[in-house]
């Protein structure tokens, strides 16, 4: 009868084991071991027992002891079980950012590891087990689906293998994959709101505001604001789940035309963009041209108004004929025209909006001097000793200098309150003088003596 010891062995891959083959008869014709493994016989006294060192055991094996005794041949097998931990435990790569509400499939691949009956694959979120399955197939693959939630943000997912050899008197061997850190996000389907001027004048500044609600995590949102090809540097203010990006836009002559204003919000691997058209226009105030800003009475004056080629002008409320960027009017300058304002109003349509610009010029008409009855009466009769104010107003542009003299020396105090005396009586020559010439007028003052009863 042949026996083997030990009958069952569990050993690490590549390890060695001592196997003893024994027989019950004293003088066996043969006693040995049959195995493909490298073996080395250890010398022992006696014929009915042999010890072999089996080395470099790479896989499960069943070495067989045999003996040939007078009563016949017999065999006995020992069962060598090799154990080893997996060579690869890996979570299939995934984008680090995942939208909330999406089903995320975690896939763990395990290469190698034995004995498979004792090998389990566990998928975890942090320390929480999501799925536990025996390792089956090569490579073994275990999957689970997770509905991504907001509170999963920053969670670590991993895959662990457990080779449990405790029933065999050994320990529990664990291997863990590199963790996958989940970044969850919410980017609403609504595009960002963009508030900006629809039209902007060259050499002015405008303010652009881009905002969006319902973002998570809002601090991770990237905001890109651009006007045409110009990057805008917004100041971003964050709320709990919202942001507001504000930028100042300065436009120059280079920007004239139609520009695309864009606000793009990038969060995770998604983006939302809003596009708006801004028309940048150049519209100088219209030009009011007078033949001469200062003319003498009776001169022909041409007043012209010229504006942007696409503008429509009105001059002193009268539209250009035909309607367009130029208007003019002709007049013969009269004293009444002095200080008259000529106002040109230009209207330009820019992207459906009417833009108005005005320019005013004043005409100066040189005339006079003038002394007439209404403003400088030729006759005054005043009671003696009464208080009177002699009035004589000379007209003209420039305003004339006025002097009223009696006998070439005695002045009449124009505009001053005086007590009427006999000295005041007489004829005065009033002379109004300016750069435009001079005029004279005689003024007579009569003084009435009081009557005594």
């Amino acid at each position: 009868q042949t026996s083997v010891s030990p009958s069952k062995v569990i050993l690490p891959r590549g390890g060695s084991v001592l196997v003893t083959c024994s027989t019950s008869c004293d003088q066996p014709k043969l006693l040995g071991i049959e195995t493909p493994l490298p073996k080395k016989e250890l010398l022992l006294p006696g014929n009915n027992r042999k010890v072999y060192e089996l080395s470099n055991v790479q896989e499960d094996s069943q070495p067989m002891c045999y003996s040939n005794c007078p009563d016949g041949q017999s065999t006995a097998k020992t069962f060598l079980t090799v154990y080893w931990t997996p060579e690869r435990v890996e979570l299939a790569p995934l984008p680090s950012w995942q939208p909330v509400g999406k089903n995320l499939t975690l896939r763990c691949q395990v290469e190698g590891g034995a004995p498979r009956a004792n090998l389990t694959v566990v998928l975890l979120r942090g320390e929480k087990e999501l799925k536990r399955e025996p390792a089956v197939g090569e490579p073994a693959e275990v999957t689970t689906t997770v509905l991504v939630r907001r509170d999963h943000h920053g969670a670590n997912f991993s895959c662990r293998t457990e080779l449990d050899l405790r029933p065999q008197g050994l320990e529990l061997f664990e291997n863990t994959s590199a963790p996958y850190q989940l970044q969850t996000f919410v980017l609403p389907a609504t595009p960002p709101q963009l508030v900006s001027p629809r039209v902007l004048e060259v050499d002015t500044q405008g303010t652009v505001v881009c905002s969006l609600d319902g973002l998570f995590p809002v601090s991770e949102a990237q905001v890109h604001l651009a006007l045409g090809d110009q990057r805008l540097n917004p100041t971003v203010t964050y709320g709990n789940d919202s942001f507001s990006a504000k930028a100042s836009v300065s436009v120059t002559a280079e920007d004239e035309g139609t520009q695309r204003l864009t606000c793009a919000v990038i969060l995770g691997n998604q983006s939302q963009e809003t596009l708006q058209t801004v028309t940048i226009y150049s519209f100088p105030a219209p030009n009011v041209i007078l033949t001469k800003p200062e003319v003498s009475e009776g001169t022909e004056v041409t007043v012209k108004c010229e504006a942007h080629p696409r503008a429509k002008v009105t001059l002193n409320g009268v539209p250009a004929q035909p309607l367009g960027p130029r208007a003019q009017l002709l007049l013969k300058a009269t004293p009444e025209d002095n200080g008259r304002s000529f106002s040109c109003s230009a209207t330009l349509e820019v992207a459906g909006q009417l833009i108005h610009k005005n320019q005013t010029r004043e005409l100066r008409v040189l005339y006079g001097p003038r002394l007439d009855e209404r403003d400088c009466p030729g006759n005054w009769t005043w009671p003696e000793n009464s208080q009177q104010t002699p009035m004589c107003q000379a007209w003209g542009n420039p305003l004339p200098e006025l002097k009223c003299l009696k006998d070439g020396t005695f002045p009449l105090p124009i505009g001053e309150s005086v007590t009427v005396t006999r000295d005041l009586e007489g004829t005065y020559l009033c002379r109004a003088r300016s750069t435009q010439g001079e005029v004279t007028r005689k003024v007579t003052v009569n003084v009435l003596s009081p009557r005594y009863e």
Partner: antibody, heavy 119, light 110 residues
Framework: QVQLVESGGGLVQPGGSLRLSCAAS????????MSWVRQAPGKGLEWVSA????????HCADSVKGRFTISRDNSKNTLYLQMSSLRAEDTAFYYC????????????WGHGTLVTVSS | SSELTQDPAVSVALGQTVKITCQGD??????ASWYQQRPGQAPVLVIY???SRPSGIPDRFSGSSSGNTASLTITGAQAEDEADYYC????????????FGGGTKLTVLG
């Protein structure tokens, strides 16, 4: 569709003058800025001049300032480049191109016209 | 300075991905636009803004930017993509309205 067709190129002596034209169709001409870009044979592109849609604003490269004048006639849908005091280094293909705004990128280009300055 | 710098020449195997770069101070303020010019033809706009393509330009062309560098990427280059590529930007120095890079000659191998 948008079409830009340059004309007026040719051989001219140093110091001479030439006027290039660019006839535009397929878009609202007065709403677009226009530019001239040149390319010397076998060399890269060089911006030359630009004009706003209204024609009120013009810009020129330093290399041609005082010698070249850009203008447009919106009633004829035509862009011009008046070139004077021409030099050998002005020899190039001259392309006209349109852009939504004066300093903007070029959406469409013409096929180009060759200007050769040589004695 | 008002210069945009490009590599003079770049090659790519048919079907592979190639990135053409453009460097310049103005790119910190303005986005680049990219033009393709085949021999004997006028330039054609392929990318503008942050990463916008005009209609008719295949989606294998894309643009990106970081700091003072703009890039044009062709994913899965085709034989017909062999051409000169020019980057172009507003000039932040104020000397010019727009400035071009020196151009990159792209060769598609195989």
């Amino acid at each position: 569709q948008v079409q830009l067709v340059e004309s007026g190129g040719g051989l001219v002596q140093p110091g001479g003058s030439l006027r290039l034209s660019c006839a535009a169709s397929g878009f609202t001409f007065s709403s677009y800025a226009m530019s001239w870009v040149r390319q010397a044979p076998g060399k890269g592109l060089e911006w030359v001049s630009a004009i706003s849609g209204s024609g009120g604003s013009t810009h020129c490269a330093d290399s041609v300032k005082g010698r070249f004048t850009i203008s447009r006639d919106n009633s004829k849908n035509t862009l011009y480049l008046q070139m004077s005091s021409l030099r050998a280094e002005d020899t190039a293909f001259y392309y006209c191109a349109n852009s939504a705004y004066t300093g903007g990128w070029y959406d469409y280009w013409g096929h180009g016209t060759l200007v050769t300055v040589s004695s | 300075s008002s210069e945009l710098t490009q590599d003079p020449a770049v090659s790519v195997a048919l079907g592979q991905t190639v990135k053409i770069t453009c460097q310049g101070d103005s790119l910190r303020t303005y986005y680049a636009s990219w033009y393709q010019q085949r021999p004997g033809q006028a330039p054609v706009l392929v990318i503008y803004g942050e990463n916008s393509r005009p209609s008719g330009i295949p989606d294998r062309f894309s643009g990106s930017s970081s700091g003072n560098t703009a890039s044009l990427t062709i994913t899965g280059a085709q034989a017909e993509d062999e051409a000169d590529y020019y980057c172009n930007s507003r000039d932040s120095s104020g000397n010019h309205l727009r400035v071009f890079g020196g151009g990159t000659k792209l060769t598609v191998l195989g």
